[in-house]
Amino acid sequence: AFGISGVQKYTRALHDSSITGISPITEYLASLSTYNDQSITFALEDESYEIYVEDLKKDEKKDKVLLSYYESQHPSNESGDGVDGKMLMVTLSPTKDFWLHANNKEHSVELHKCEKPLPDQAFFVLHNMHSNCVSFECKTDPGVFIGVKDNHLALIKVDSSENLCTENILFKLSET
């Protein structure tokens, strides 16, 4: 996949990285769907939000997510084997004050209500893919990506960069 640095190389860089600005470089609303064109939807149930992966009925409106993009600078180390340069990180908010969070203990993706500054669990490194899809890598757990498992979003460990094109971690963004 394009833009993918080897997963292992990111390990130190992600933990060392810092968001260079408190304000995003850009933001926009988009619907999120899987590689197989299933929609990511959000439903309020018992005062908490649930995230679903489902086929929408014809003419059914897609849920929109506010994507906020941040630059993250990470240093190269003296020995020359460190990752240098800038990464593009994203937060995803389907409704006011709620953000997608990585729950690394449960290997789950959850919606949490929180105030800014957002915790690291709400930041995902954005990767562009060959198919013009994107993937979202946990800032807090390098090599772990948002993926689809049993019609839900889950955290999926990707062992090598060859596996970064697996369909279950690929998503499409659409403004329509």
């Epitope: 394009f2 833009g3 993918i4 850009t26 926009y28 630059e71 340069g85 890598e137």
Partner: antibody, heavy 122, light 107 residues
Framework: EVQLVESGGGLVQPGGSLRLSCAAS????????MHWVRQAPGKGLEYVST????????YYADSVKGRFTISRDNSKNTLYLQLGSLRPEDMAVYYC???????????????WGQGTLVTVSS | DIQMTQSPSSVSASVGDRVTITCRAS??????LAWYQQKPGKAPKLLIY???NLQSGVPSRFSGSGSGTDFTLTITSLQPEDFATYYC?????????FGPGTKVDIK
Amino acid sequence: EVQLVESGGGLVQPGGSLRLSCAASGFTFSTYSMHWVRQAPGKGLEYVSTINNNGDTTYYADSVKGRFTISRDNSKNTLYLQLGSLRPEDMAVYYCARQTYTSSWYGGFDSWGQGTLVTVSS
Amino acid sequence: DIQMTQSPSSVSASVGDRVTITCRASQGITSWLAWYQQKPGKAPKLLIYAASNLQSGVPSRFSGSGSGTDFTLTITSLQPEDFATYYCQQANSLPFTFGPGTKVDIK
């Protein structure tokens, strides 16, 4: 300081081939996707090809698909473009470029080489 | 493929002038647009990325705006070193495409 230096250009006959190189320094080459862009004399910029950081995924503009091959050697910090079945319309300055973000192409290309001229003529 | 158009194709201006160049995409590219400056015989130089973000080291007289399909590059007070050709590029999806360029020359 980021540096990209292209080489390998020259005069070639139609139908001939050539290999361009781009030597990278001043950054961790193996963490970046890299790109080739060309510019015909007196014309605008044209995207040619992209390769991801470890070389296992490539993409080509329709105009060069099946004729050009992009590759890289991370141990040598070098990007390549093999040009084949060359046509007069391939005559251009070829630039290698690094994308702004390690993980994403959304930021465009922040570093460019000085370019190498490929002349296709009989 | 996404087509990019630019206007005007050329503009004659004087030092101190405000210059505005527009770029239009054939379909929505959100904010993923870059602007480059190129001088004769030189490589392009990134000025603006993500539509409105100034690349490090670029003077603040350059600014970018827009989203979706319509974008603008503005040079607030043209300096002698700004006479060049300017290109927009969509960085939203492969294959990346460039606008045809706008040449800014001396009036």
